[in-house]
Interface confidence: low
Amino acid sequence: KRFRDVLGHEQYPDHMREHNQLRGWSSDENEWDEHLYPVWRRGDGRWKDSWEGGRVQAVLTSDSPALVGSNITFVVNLVFPRCQKEDANGNIVYEKNCRNDLGLTSDLHVYNWTAGADDGDWEDGTSRSQHLRFPDRRPFPRPHGWKKWSFVYVFHTLGQYFQKLGRCSARVSINTVNLTAGPQVMEVTVFRRYGRAYIPISKVKDVYVITDQIPVFVTMSQKNDRNLSDEIFLRDLPIVFDVLIHDPSHFLNDSAISYKWNFGDNTGLFVSNNHTLNHTYVLNGTFNLNLTVQTAVPGPCPPPSPSTPPPPSTPPSPPPSPLPTLSTPSPSLMPTGYKSMELSDISNENCRINRYGYFRATITIVEGILEVSIMQIADVPMPTPQPANSLMDFTVTCKGATPMEACTIISDPTCQIAQNRVCSPVAVDGLCLLSVRRAFNGSGTYCVNFTLGDDASLALTSTLISIPGKDPDSPLRAVN
């Protein structure tokens, strides 16, 4: 049997293999040692018994999408049946005082692999070391602490495989410099020691994406905006645009990145070297925001051809929006047509290639409440004898849209612990002036929060107010 027969049934075309060679990986045309690593078909009853106490789940994650040329990292974590864990020596033990289907477990071994292993196992040429090999019969590496590594992980993608010894977690990074853009599948099979052989305990696969466009995501925030996720913002208040570039391997760290903004409101093109930018829309309406991110990254040198002039360095047009489907876990660009780029083997020349990323959004600008202020605070005269509560009248003004609701939160002087919250619809005159009467339970210092809201906005102001005791000479104090 060959690796491809064991690990995956989808044939990987030969012409693709040539373009997508991974450094340190091997062709899945290699032979698989079926004696040391038995192959079980789906539905084989032995899968059920391959692990004591249940099935081991392998969870595979990656930091996809990856820009061509960057590194992409895959992590496999093994999740053991309930009440089982890996100890410091790499053995699998039952957790103390944990209740599983068998009742309470004591701290006994599920698998005590290191107890039977000794350094003599590594003596090459002896029958004892013949089993310390990967499925392609390569011997295991011998780093410090090898005895604690009880699992063999076989990663398989792009018609190639990579073998690794590990504990309950394994990590592999690949460089995407020679890879074709597009979605790919990574499959991982995990084996455990079983006497002098290795049996499969779990299999997992996941999609990852190689892209020739910079994966870009933009967060948009604005003071007084009621809902940050609805892409509705307020007129006459700055919106903060913050560009996040998905670059977990820091491939772009040494590249200068330029951001070209078109806000769709006829204010022209803004070019910036900063990932954050403020912009204020002064008209209501719907606007198409376009961002192009550009950078130069190390790339292939074009073959010398004196007769052909170099192509102009214009950005390609952004991809069409993806069909509505579940989005990938991290922000990604998955254009419908992937360009494949053959990378030359010339690595000693310092050529650079332009890469682009795109972000588009349709944002709606509406009128909102821009500002709230407390104009006046007045003590409401009370009949004699005075009740325990003090009544205060607050005169509040606002700018912008007419609020529909006013909320008052009375809290402790630190403004942390709310004591009372009252919301009510409001009738506001054309000048946006309203009077709010609130009761205070006894003397002391209070924090008073006023929020005025409408469908799109929520504006806030706070003040500290000192309610005097019942001595008629003690004054009311407000500290804004």
């Epitope: 989808e10 789906r42 309930r82 599948v185 299999k203 696969k205 489907t325 579940l326 876990p329």
Partner: antibody, heavy 120, light 107 residues
Framework: QLQLQQSGTEVVKPGASVKIPCKAS????????MNWVKQRPGKGLEWIGQ????????NDNGKFEGKATLTVDKSSNTAYIQLSSLTSEDSAVYFC?????????????WGQGTSVTVSS | SIVMTQTPKFLLVSAGDRVTITCKAS??????VAWFQQKPGQSPELLIY???NRYTGVPDRFTGSGYGTDFTFTISTVQAEDLAVYFC?????????FGGGTRLEIK
């Protein structure tokens, strides 16, 4: 237009078997998991298992071992569930539902369900 | 297998009310939780995936949150057409398991 088409109703005798089809159209059949979910009348949902048409890989709920077998026919873009040794406990609606490879449990499109009645 | 304990089992609310349903996993399932709506006589429909992501075309009155073992599903302003049974589901561990469901009825 994306569709998962299931047969309407199956009436079968106790001890017999039944094979329920789910015909997919409007998307890349081989690139999505196909899940099967059981729902007894007035009850909740029970996940039976899933199959990846791209390579026939399956991921099963051990509770249905020996009861449910999942297969696919890539040429007709059809997934099947075969239920064997049927009893009254197997009377239920069986849904097929697809899920993307990277979010294999998030079933975003469902068939209309096939009602299986086990009765002598 | 993971047990998903969903509460409450039944909700009787008025149109315009805010509704919260909770789901507790018997062990951590990261953020791999989905929420489904099943209207009478229909197939379930995906509303939320990966705990908090609203599926394409789902109105923004439906939201989800949570991580690890505790998850919450909220309808900010219930409408008459929201009459349905709502299910949570974990898809971190196989077998994937559903909560028992919450029947939402409108007064």
């Amino acid at each position: 237009q994306l569709q998962l088409q299931q047969s309407g109703t199956e009436v079968v005798k106790p001890g017999a078997s039944v094979k329920i089809p789910c015909k997919a159209s409007g998307y890349a059949f081989s690139s999505y998991w196909m899940n099967w979910v059981k729902q007894r009348p007035g009850k909740g949902l029970e996940w039976i298992g899933q199959i990846y048409p791209g390579d026939g890989d399956t991921n099963d709920n051990g509770k249905f071992e020996g009861k449910a077998t999942l297969t696919v026919d890539k040429s007709s873009n059809t997934a099947y569930i075969q239920l064997s040794s049927l009893t009254s406990e197997d009377s239920a609606v069986y849904f097929c539902a697809r899920s993307p490879l990277h979010l294999r449990g998030s079933m975003d499109y469902w068939g209309q369900g096939t009602s299986v009645t086990v009765s002598s | 297998s993971i047990v998903m304990t969903q509460t409450p089992k039944f909700l009787l609310v008025s149109a315009g009310d805010r509704v919260t349903i909770t789901c507790k996993a018997s062990q951590s399932v990261s953020n791999d939780v989905a929420w489904f709506q099943q209207k009478p006589g229909q197939s379930p429909e995906l509303l939320i995936y990966s705990a908090s992501n609203r599926y394409t075309g789902v109105p923004d009155r439906f939201t989800g949150s949570g991580y690890g073992t505790d998850f919450t599903f909220t309808i900010s302003t219930v409408q008459a057409e929201d009459l349905a049974v709502y299910f949570c589901q974990q898809n971190y561990y196989s077998p994937f398991t559903f909560g028992g469901g919450t029947r939402l009825e409108i007064k």
